[in-house]
């Protein structure tokens, strides 16, 4: 007996071939011997089965001796043994219809769990193997669980259902609601304008919610809310903003914040949260601000950085076109009685310059 696997809601074509390539009498019946469709003269006739409004045949192939039965909008209960009667012979085809659906909404927050449930006909014992867009393989039986969704799980999941050495493939689109980056750091010289951007890793037709940026300045003992905002159909409106600093926010996505001036007292780290309408939980993105200041006071040339820096970062003071350099893995470096000329303060990571500030030392007479 031939086995054919089908997908719930899909279409299947069951084939039946006569030995002679010509138009002849044929009938398709179910296991209860109820006629589904057949030929009468040159016309397709339908029987009293519950499939009749969803069953059809490729009439154009009848004169080739091919008498297919097409079943549209498959249901799990269409799983049955179908019998094609042609030229005094019977061909049996066992149809097994499976459905694979996500238990919840397919738009899930990062860290939430995804459960896929397999609907299958009674008596079947299928196995399921799913592959995430990032190449992660998960196996299961009637249910498949992904406990903690990650950003890279967004996209089309391909799930293969196997039964009797046959397979059928399902594609399920999963959208992981998250920011494109978990964390970002902005490096600025004192006095420069600071731009913070929070691009989303997904697109939704309607995007509504509310958000807030909490800031923990390095010099402050506690964090404070810098700005709160609403998001309505991808339009951003500010609800409340602190007086110091006076942040500005873009009206369109991606979420965009501007700090007029980078000052040492603002250096630190922030956490932007976004709560989406009809979703439990919040999206998070961490943002860091590192501020550099180079100053000359009497005989002392100093370069300092404030904000969250890694211990492996190097801070250097270097005289342009000269070999004179002082470097430290610290947040401040200085040179006593510096030579006259243009000095560069550099914050670097393994040779890659993250931030630089120039200061001119004039000769003292």
């Amino acid at each position: 007996k031939k086995v054919v696997l089908g997908k719930k809601g899909d279409t299947v074509e069951l084939t039946c071939n006569a030995s002679q390539k010509k138009n002849t009498q044929f009938h398709w019946k179910n296991s209860n011997q109820i006629k589904i469709l057949g030929i009468q003269g040159l016309f397709l006739t339908k029987g009293p089965s519950k499939l009749s409004d969803r069953a059809d045949s490729r009439k154009s192939l009848w004169d080739q001796g091919c008498f297919s039965m097409i079943i549209k909008n498959l249901k799990i209960e269409d799983s049955d043994t179908y019998i094609c009667e042609v030229e005094n012979k019977k061909e049996e085809v066992e149809l097994l219809v499976f459905g694979l659906t996500a238990n919840s909404d397919t738009h899930l927050l990062e860290g939430q769990s995804l459960t896929l449930t397999l609907e299958s006909p009674p008596g079947s014992s299928p196995s399921v193997k799913c592959r995430s867009p990032g190449g992660k393989n998960i196996q299961g039986g009637r249910t498949i669980s992904v406990p903690q969704l990650e950003r890279q799980d967004s996209g089309t999941w391909t799930c293969t259902v196997s039964q009797d050495q046959k397979t059928v493939e399902f594609k399920i689109d999963i959208v992981v609601l998250a920011f494109q980056k978990a964390s970002s750091t902005v490096y600025k010289k004192e006095g420069e304008q600071v731009e913070f951007s929070f691009p989303l890793a997904f697109t939704l037709e309607k995007l509504t919610g509310s958000g807030e940026l909490w800031w923990q300045a390095e010099r402050a003992s506690s964090s404070k809310s810098w700005i709160t905002f609403d998001l309505k159909n991808k339009e951003v409106s500010v609800k409340r903003v602190t007086q110091d600093p006076k942040l500005q926010m873009g009206k369109k996505l991606p979420l965009h914040l501007t700090l007029p001036q980078a000052l040492p007292q603002y250096a630190g780290s922030g956490n932007l949260t976004l709560a989406l309408e009809a979703k439990t939980g919040k999206l998070h993105q961490e943002v860091n601000l590192v501020v550099m200041r180079a100053t000359q006071f009497q005989e002392n040339l100093t370069c300092e950085v404030w904000g969250p820096t890694s211990p492996k970062l190097t801070l250097s003071l270097k005289l342009e076109n000269k070999g004179a350099t002082v470097s430290k893995q610290a947040k401040a470096v200085w040179v006593l009685n510096p030579e006259a000329g243009m000095w560069q303060c550099l914050l670097s990571d393994s040779g890659q310059v993250l931030l630089e500030s120039n200061i001119k030392v004039v000769p003292t007479w």
Epitope: T11, E13, L42, D56, K59, S60, D63, I70, K72, E169
Partner: antibody
């Protein structure tokens, strides 16, 4: 989404054999109950169905072209091909590849953009 | 083979008007074995209707199909500027699959 792209020579000499290939992108040629067709359109005229190959590899040809026609599939390259022999000027046409699926069987829901074939010495 | 005849050969109408295109088969193609296509110059045909009256994916509801047996109709309720094209009917009730000669809908 699924796209079809025809390729082959634009000019063929009479009595020679025409070879055209249709490359399917966006889906596997063997993934569904699809039938893959060749259809042609003579300059300024209507459409003529040439034949098709099914998901199972069965071929069905227009009787008027059957003796000169071969349609085959290469699943590893996601392509299907047409070979039409003993060409005459009457075979000059735009050749399209197309797909039908069982939910709208024998009606062609996706077409290639077509390739013009001229039979001339 | 089943021969399809389309009428009229050319239909001259203005945008906003109703267009009624006819397709007649030389013998019955069954109740639903007929499709309609639209073709614009230099482009491949586009499936509009299959199964005599089912709209293909993405086709606006101003296009509708009706008929069975040997007589079928494509109706465009209100012509839009982009609807001016050639329309073909195709039968799949019998092998070989055949197309009609087409009806050209042009701007009056």
């Amino acid at each position: 989404q699924v796209q079809l792209q025809e390729s082959g020579p634009g000019l063929v000499k009479p009595s020679q054999t025409l070879s055209l290939t249709c490359t399917v992108s966006g889906d596997s040629i063997s993934s569904g109950y699809y039938y893959w067709s060749w259809i042609r359109q003579h300059p300024g005229k209507g459409l003529e169905w040439i034949g098709y190959i099914s998901y199972s590899g069965s071929t069905y040809y227009n009787p008027s072209l059957k003796s000169r026609l071969t349609i085959s599939v290469n699943t590893s390259k996601n392509q299907f091909s047409l070979k039409l022999s003993s060409l005459t000027a009457a075979d000059t046409a735009v050749y399209y590849c197309a797909r039908d699926r069982p939910s709208n069987f024998d009606a062609f829901d996706i077409w290639g953009q077509g390739t013009m074939v001229t039979v001339s010495s | 083979e089943i021969v399809l005849t389309q009428s009229p050969g050319t239909l001259s109408l203005s945008p906003g008007e109703r267009a009624t295109l006819s397709c007649r088969a030389s013998q019955s193609v069954g109740s639903t074995y007929l499709a309609w296509y639209q073709q614009k110059p230099g482009q491949a045909p586009r499936l509009l209707i299959y199964g005599a009256f089912s709209r293909a994916t993405g086709i606006p509801d101003r296009f509708s199909g009706s008929g069975s047996g040997t007589d079928f109709t494509l109706t465009i309720s209100r012509l839009e500027p982009e609807d001016f094209a050639v329309y073909y009917c195709q039968q799949y009730g019998s092998s070989p699959l055949t197309f009609g000669p087409g009806t050209k809908v042009d701007i009056k």
